[in-house]
Structures are given as structure tokens and as C-alpha cells.
Amino acid sequence: LVPHLGDREKRDSVCPQGKYIHPQNNSICCTKCHKGTYLYNDCPGPGQDTDCRECESGSFTASENHLRHCLSCSKCRKEMGQVEISSCTVDRDTVCGCRKNQYRHYWSENLFQCFNCSLCLNGTVHLSCQEKQNTVCTCHAGFFLRENECVSCSNCKKSLECTKLCLPQIENVKGTEDSGTT
């Protein structure tokens, strides 16, 4: 089976690696622009230089290309708690991340929010906090896990999933209620 190629891939595949086919003359292969630059003008003929210009401030290209414009630098989303790890350069996009003792929660492939790692109060750390995953906690006796926090079994209602973990405590609470004591 031959893989389906898009028009740009078809055009590029005619030329050797590092070159692309001239859009107006398919007998000419032009050298691609280096990262950090973009295509200003196609090469006028075989063996002649492609006119590449450096990306302007606030834009970049991270690989060799024949793009007519550089890509806009990403901005770290302060409202999502993101901080800038490294600023944008002509050949590398901005790198955004989270502060120490925080992890990333991805709302989508490209959008993440920073959250504080759980400290496992009233429990122990089962798995340490990682870049993209919160700490995994194991709760002490008399506590159950709710939204990755160890909550006292006194907050466990019969309708919740905590009933199995907190069964003795629930029975005690029920017994107290039945006896009429305060």
C-alpha cells in the first residue's frame, strides 16, 4: 500500500532532503531555510541561493522550512498558573511550565493548568508528584480518599463510595444516632 501524501509532501518528495520544489517551476529544487529563518523569496534557478530572512522578534521557526512567515511565539497562560521556563528565541518557541511542587493538568492537548501537589495529610505518599500527575496518596485508618485528599470518615455518608473503607466508623455513627445520645 502506498501512503497517501498531501500536495506539499508530494512536492517535497521529488527533491532531495533539505530541498523543496520551486512552486512555479517543478524542475527546480531550492534549498530550505535554516531554523530561525523563513522563506522571503524562492531560489531563482538551480544551484542558486534561496532568499531566507531571520525571524523577527516575537516569532520563530524551530526546524528547516520553506514557510512564508515565522510562527508567533506562544505566551504562557498566567491565568492558568503557568510560568515561563525559557523565553522565545528565533529558533525555539517559549517553554511554559509550573512552579516547584506543582503539576500540570491538561484541559486539552495544548492547554494546561498548574495545580499544587497533594501533601497527603492524614495519609502517606504512594506515588510522588510528577510533571503531569498529582501525588497518589494512601490514607490512614479512619480516613478515605476524596479528590486526592484524605478526609475523615466522619464525613462519609452512606450514599458515597467511602462506605466500604469507613464501614466500622459508619456503624459507630449509626449506633450513636439510634441510642439518642448527643
Epitope: W107, S108, L111
Partner: nanobody, 122 residues
Framework: EVQLLESGGGLVQPGGSLRLSCAAS????????MGWVRQAPGKGLEWVSL????????YYADSVKGRFTISRNNSKNTLYLQMNSLRAEDTAVYYC???????????????WGQGTVVTVSS
């Protein structure tokens, strides 16, 4: 057919509270991020809050942080927005929906409701 039906809006005095509900049907509610946006008179749409499928992660716009609480009940296919300490600037049409994040912070939804009006006035 996907349906999202908001309710709970109304007229409230500054400092008062309201609880908005959003009943969802026609899709697997429990699998998706959900959110609330609002549109104040003569203004554009703005994000208010987001919640992930489990309810364990939430996002709030700075303007509502500490006053609004988003929650969900997946067994009832319902999204909620508890609004406390309401201010005149919270006056808007509030919409719930299933968000898309292709161009954050632009507001985009796959599905959204018809909206519920919240008016904060003395």
C-alpha cells in the same frame, strides 16, 4: 440530540447568592470537561469556570475566584455554579457548555445551552 438546559437565574441584590444548574442530555456527560461562560450587556463572551470529568480539577476566572464554585453530579448529568457575594458586574447571561480549547482564551463550545439571565441590582 444534544441538549443543555440552564436554570436558576434571576434578580438578586448585591451580596446575594444564586445557584445555576445545567441539565445535560444526548451525550456521555461524565466523560467530558464542562464549563460556564457569561456575556454581560454589550460585552463579549468570557470564561467563568471549568471542571474536569471527575470534578477534581477546576478553573475560575480571576473576577469570580473565591466567590463562585463549580461542581457536577455525573449520576444526574447536571452541572452547577454556586454564585455567592454577587456584584453588579456579575450581571450577564450565563451559558453552560462542553468546551473546546483550540484557541484559549477564545470562548469555544461543541455544545451549549440557551442561557439563563442573572441580574444583580438593588
Amino acid at each position: 440530540e444534544v441538549q443543555l438546559l440552564e436554570s436558576g437565574g434571576g434578580l438578586v441584590q448585591p451580596g446575594g447568592s444564586l445557584r445555576l444548574s445545567c441539565a445535560a442530555s444526548g451525550f456521555t456527560f461524565a466523560r467530558y470537561n464542562m464549563g460556564w461562560v457569561r456575556q454581560a450587556p454589550g460585552k463579549g463572551l468570557e470564561w467563568v469556570s471549568l471542571i474536569d470529568p471527575s470534578g477534581g480539577h477546576t478553573y475560575y476566572a480571576d473576577s469570580v475566584k473565591g466567590r463562585f464554585t463549580i461542581s457536577r453530579n455525573n449520576s444526574k448529568n447536571t452541572l452547577y455554579l454556586q454564585m455567592n457575594s454577587l456584584r453588579a458586574e456579575d450581571t450577564a447571561v450565563y451559558y453552560c457548555g462542553k468546551p473546546v480549547f483550540s484557541d484559549w482564551p477564545a470562548v469555544e463550545f461543541d455544545y451549549w445551552g440557551q442561557g439563563t439571565v442573572v441580574t444583580v441590582s438593588s
